[in-house]
């Protein structure tokens, strides 16, 4: 096994955006320790929420990696409202190979939430020569960047879409685009396609904007 | 200084897409060596193009990093056509802390180039209530992902734009969006805005699509 005189490293990951926005899902903060040696394989975790120690984390069995070190993961389930209200989550990792415990802290991006504006854009006239066309959903002006986007038609999910990662805009908010690809015939028949967005700053955390060939829709 | 028994690491970076597509620019392959120790600071580079050693690389003075290690960079200028034709560039790094030299190889993404389709999309009617509006350029169907996008108006560059990274589409090609933000008044006055795209599969490696309020443009 390689000697790792630098000792283990610790990485702390936030919950998935969708998990924090939906009550029936389970948001988790994940503390990952890598480069744990065979000589000192024992890792101890302590978790704190706003500085107060909590004891409901679950530590998974350590996993051996290809480079003959271990990876150890501890997962803390968080309360939706605690995360959205900006509470701080600290993971404190102790291991004999470390001169002192490593502490990592994470919380929701600070700053005033801003509501996304959602705009749907029909295909370019030039694309109408193709068999398939692109329907576009521009989601802009939102903060923080945690967001979820999907498409529907006639109340049923549309699956052939692709969404860009949120990008930082010049005003400090975020934007993204989502592209739904549909057969031109479906578009020309006047079917209605809807772009759905979930974000914490939206009323009811949800909005939907529709798009169809017939004008005014 | 920390002991780094793993020794240095080597990273090889491709040229910027725009540099490979414009004859007036200088495409460079960059070889970066990190975690070079004070004990063994000397780094030797050898460069190969399609297996043949070349001697025109420039090695920069080593730079001390915050963690008391050195970072050393060597830059090889490449011929535009060599890169676009898929030649392989190898950087071979020797250092006393390494049991054997480290070799890294890079070349243009393999596969048949595919020409981007470029579509400009005007602002949504709903956005016209705002002081600024979003002009969208959808670039899709291209391969490989190396591409450059910019905006201009009346032959002058427009700077308030933001371009998403290329995203892999369902057919194996790439797409991206670029969003230009302009004052609504400029849009309503009928100014013409153009999205310029550079990609190796385009005729003359360049195309431009325009967008304005007046119909048919």
């Amino acid at each position: 096994a390689p000697e790792l005189l630098g000792g283990p490293s610790v990485f702390l990951f936030p919950p998935k955006p969708k998990d924090t926005l939906m009550i029936s899902r389970t948001p988790e903060v994940t503390c990952v320790v890598v480069d744990v040696s065979h000589e000192d394989p024992e890792v101890q975790f302590k978790w704190y929420v706003d500085g107060v120690e909590v004891h409901n984390a679950k530590t998974k069995p350590r996993e051996e990696q290809y480079n003959s070190t271990f990876r150890v993961v501890s997962v803390l389930t968080v309360l939706h409202q605690d995360w959205l209200n900006g509470k701080e989550y600290k993971c404190k990792v102790s291991n004999k190979a470390l001169p002192a415990p490593i502490e990592k802290t994470i919380s929701k991006t600070k700053g005033q939430p801003r509501e996304p504006q959602v705009y749907t854009l029909p295909p370019s006239r030039e694309e109408m020569t193709k068999n398939q066309v692109s329907l576009t959903c521009l989601v802009k002006g939102f903060y923080p960047s945690d967001i979820a986007v999907e498409w529907e038609s006639s109340g049923q999910p549309e699956n052939n879409y692709n969404t860009t990662p949120p990008m930082l805009d010049s005003d400090g908010s975020f934007f993204l685009y989502s592209k739904l690809t549909v057969d031109k015939s479906r578009w020309q028949q006047g079917n209605i396609f809807s772009c759905s967005v979930m974000h914490e700053a939206l009323h009811n955390r949800f909005t939907q904007k529709s798009l169809s060939l017939s004008p005014g829709k | 200084a920390p002991e780094l028994l793993g020794g240095p690491s080597v990273f090889l970076f491709p040229p910027k897409p725009k540099d490979t597509l414009m004859i007036s620019r200088t495409p460079e392959v960059t070889c970066v060596v990190v975690d070079v120790s004070h004990e063994d600071p000397e780094v030797q580079f050898k460069w190969y193009v399609d297996g043949v050693e070349v001697h025109n690389a420039k090695t920069k003075p080593r730079e001390e990093q915050y963690n008391s290690t050195f970072r050393v960079v060597s830059v090889l200028t490449v011929l535009h056509q060599d890169w676009l034709n898929g030649k392989e560039y190898k950087c071979k790094v020797s250092n006393k802390a390494l049991p054997a030299p480290i070799e890294k190889t890079i070349s243009k993404t393999k596969g048949q180039p595919r020409e981007p389709q470029v579509y400009t999309l005007p602002p949504s009617r709903e956005e016209m209530t705002k002081n600024q509006v979003s002009l969208t350029c959808l670039v899709k169907g291209f391969y490989p992902s190396d591409i450059a996008v910019e905006w201009e108006s009346s032959g002058q560059p427009e700077n308030n734009y933001n371009t998403t990274p290329p995203m892999l589409d369902s057919d194996g090609s790439f797409f991206l969006y670029s969003k230009l933000t302009v004052d609504k008044s400029r849009w309503q006055q009928g100014n013409i805005f153009s999205c310029s795209v550079m990609h190796e599969a385009l005729h003359n490696r360049f195309t431009q699509k325009s967008l304005s309020l007046s119909p048919g443009k």
Epitope: M22, I23, E150, S194, M198, H203, F206 | -
Partner: nanobody, 121 residues
Framework: QVQLQESGGGLVQAGDSLRISCRAS????????MGWFRQAPGKEREFVGR??????????YYVDSVKGRFTISRDSAKNTVYLQMNSLKLEDTAVYLC????????????WGQGTQVTVSS
């Protein structure tokens, strides 16, 4: 354990009204798209309509054949979704199934067993 349990079906006269319910356990109806489907004997399962996630009805969708007659609503406190059916027609006879879909999911994730609605003349 996620469960959707329909109830309230029965035999009614054409032109009458009926409200059927779908009680959820193991999930929260406000978090999901909650939909109603129906399956008449010897026919394919047919989508009826759905409400979107969040405590609102702004984006509720109905198929044309039930628009104006059927209404989907939700009671978050009871974690229950309802289908109010008015002006029932003979062709509304079917087993009515409740379904839930997570945001971003490509298909309906959770299904109930169904409740029989029979409309007679």
């Amino acid at each position: 354990q996620v469960q959707l349990q329909e109830s309230g079906g029965g035999l009614v006269q054409a032109g009458d009204s009926l409200r059927i319910s779908c009680r959820a356990s193991g999930l929260t109806v406000n978090d999901l798209y909650m939909g109603w489907f129906r399956q008449a004997p010897g026919k394919e399962r047919e989508f009826v309509g759905r409400v979107t996630p969040g405590d609102n009805t702004d984006y509720t969708y109905y198929v044309d054949s039930v628009k104006g007659r059927f209404t989907i609503s939700r009671d978050s406190a009871k974690n229950t979704v309802y289908l109010q059916m008015n002006s029932l027609k003979l062709e509304d006879t079917a087993v009515y199934l409740c379904a839930g879909r997570r945001f971003g999911s490509s298909e309906w994730d959770y299904w109930g067993q169904g409740t029989q609605v029979t409309v007679s003349s």
